[in-house]
Interface confidence: low
């Protein structure tokens, strides 16, 4: 959560001289309350936009727009504080619109916009517009808030942004998974154009159950340049347990741009028929950070083996 780096922050418009300032998120009207305060914004609109930074990176930004109510309180409106709260971290960023001239009623409703909050994929934010000065204690609130969920890197518009591309969003492994027999699973996928290793994470489940009955991790060493974009296949040995028949295969790449936090891709093979269900096994969290959409992996008390090939 940050401000777009190089844009001149402009809030002036015809009939209003205005400047945008960084804010500590604590306007002094909290400390020195005023008797007369403006009403709250009428509507807040938020949508996602993509902007370029001074370094040429494409980043997702929030486009925030709000309008004023058509009451006399605009005569006491001295500005606005925009606050964006990232819900999973409680990180907050604020800016202040400071009106350098008095607002007057004119023929159309006053409208303000701001498009400089840089956000992260797959994160939820609470956007608040607070009219200034803020109300006296126990006064009527003069702010409006709205939540906005930024799409993840699967979203077409997000896929081409720098944070998504650096997480590996442009790689499409086109995974195919085939059950060879009761004990072997063949996984095929397309390698990316980087000499990096991959990890295949196999988690098997009983039919209609979310507790795993087997898991196995297999490393694929970094391909040579001539193998880039080629198909690689791996044969995984399954646990020989009746009913342990639904297999989720997840491929985790380790691209240099995202290291152990790259986007994972998965495919699932369903059970052929309703089996018996074994005892559930507890969840765990691995040492790396799971990306959105990745599953937890499970403990296992059996052996698994695998081998792989690169196809030219």
């Amino acid at each position: 959560l940050r401000l777009l780096d190089h844009r001149a922050l402009v809030c002036s418009q015809p009939g209003l001289n205005c400047t945008v300032k960084n804010s500590t998120c604590l306007d002094d009207s909290w400390i020195h309350p005023r008797n007369l305060t403006p009403s709250s914004p009428k509507n807040i609109y938020i949508n996602l936009s993509v902007s370029s930074t001074q370094h040429g990176e494409l980043v997702p930004v929030l486009h925030v727009e709000w309008t004023l109510q058509t009451d006399a309180s605009i005569l006491y409106l001295e500005g606005a504080e925009l606050s964006v709260l990232q819900l999973n971290t409680n990180e907050r960023l604020c800016v202040r619109f400071e009106f350098l001239s008095k607002l007057r009623h004119h023929h159309r409703r006053w409208r303000f916009t701001f498009s400089h909050f840089v956000v992260d994929p797959d994160q939820e934010y609470e956007v608040t517009v607070h009219h200034l000065p803020k109300p006296i204690p126990d006064g009527d609130p003069n702010h409006q808030s709205k939540n906005f969920l930024v799409p993840d890197c699967e979203h077409a518009r997000m896929k081409v942004t720098t944070p998504c591309m650096s997480s590996g969003s442009l790689w499409d492994p086109n995974i195919t998974v085939e059950t060879l027999d009761t004990q072997h699973l063949r996984v095929d996928f397309t390698l990316w154009n980087e000499s990096t290793h991959y990890q295949i994470l196999l988690t098997s489940f009983p039919h209609m159950e979310n507790h795993s009955c087997f898991e196995h991790m297999h490393h694929i060493p970094a391909p040579r340049p001539e193998e880039f974009h080629q198909r690689s296949n791996v044969t995984l040995t399954l646990r020989n347990l009746k009913g342990c028949c639904r297999h989720q295969v997840q491929i985790q790449p380790f691209f240099s741009s995202c290291l152990n936090d790259c986007l994972r891709h998965s495919a699932t093979v369903s059970c052929p028929e309703m089996p018996d269900t074994p005892e559930p096994i507890p969840d765990y969290m691995p040492l790396w950070e799971p990306r959105s959409g990745s599953s937890d992996y499970k403990d296992d008390d059996d052996k698994g083996s695998s081998h792989h090939h690169h196809h030219h």
Epitope: N260, L287, E289, D302
Partner: antibody
Framework: EVQLVESGGGLVQPGGSLRLSCAAS????????MNWVRQAPGKGLEWVSF????????YYADSVKGRFTISRDNAKNSLYLQMNSLRDEDTAVYYC???????????WGQGTTVTVSS | DIQMTQSPSSLSASVGDRVTITCRAS??????LAWYQQKPGKFPELLIY???TLQSGVPSRFSGSGSGTDFTLTISSLQPEDVATYYC?????????FGPGTKVDIK
């Protein structure tokens, strides 16, 4: 060069507090989960705490739960361990350690010594 | 919580000997196991991860095997510089427990 440097250790009385820091350099700190591991004098390694890359997952060993707090500041490439209500048995060398892709911890700091004594 | 045990707790062997250290988990952990070497006064160094994968830069005389609950670290030909304490560690789920260690020295 990939490097982790711990600081903040020292002598503290039982019941006191200390804050350890770990400065990371030479790699993209914000992409990695991190751990604190300690080693009491003449003893083995004891895992203390874990924090995921975006601080969304945090774990503690039972021996420190409720007394220690792990945190990180990705903007400053720093990992922290706030240690409160310190006990004699917390005396140890404290290491920060980075997990390797695929498993284990491949980068360790030199360690900082915490001595709890009256 | 899963307990990790190591045996032996210490051993003495001659230069060139084959040395085997075992690590046992009280419950299955698949191949989520690492081995570390710690020389006196130094920080630990990763030798093996994923039970059997040799960490880059580690001499090939070190090898790891096992899956589930029983794991082995083997030094095929003990060298003077291998004098150290060796630890196993599980990393399938928190707590990421270490074994108590095996101290290796030269006869």
């Amino acid at each position: 060069e990939v490097q982790l440097v711990e600081s903040g250790g020292g002598l503290v009385q039982p019941g006191g507090s200390l804050r350890l820091s770990c400065a990371a350099s030479g790699f993209t700190f914000s992409s990695y989960s991190m751990n604190w591991v300690r080693q009491a004098p003449g003893k083995g390694l004891e895992w203390v705490s874990f924090i995921s890359a975006r601080s969304s997952t945090i774990y503690y060993a039972d021996s420190v739960k409720g007394r220690f707090t792990i945190s990180r500041d990705n903007a400053k490439n720093s990992l922290y361990l706030q240690m409160n209500s310190l006990r004699d048995e917390d005396t140890a060398v404290y290491y920060c350690a980075r997990p390797k892709v695929g498993g284990g911890m491949d980068v360790w700091g030199q360690g900082t010594t915490v001595t709890v004594s009256s | 919580d899963i307990q990790m045990t190591q045996s032996p707790s210490s051993l003495s062997a001659s230069v060139g000997d084959r040395v085997t250290i075992t690590c046992r988990a009280s419950q299955g952990i698949s191949n989520y196991l690492a081995w570390y070497q710690q020389k006196p006064g130094k920080f630990p160094e990763l030798l093996i991860y994923a039970a059997s994968t040799l960490q880059s830069g580690v001499p090939s005389r070190f090898s790891g095997s096992g899956s589930g609950t029983d794991f082995t670290l083997t030094i095929s030909s003990l060298q003077p510089e291998d004098v150290a304490t060796y630890y196993c560690q599980k990393y399938n789920r928190a707590p990421f427990t270490f074994g108590p260690g095996t101290k290796v020295d030269i006869k």
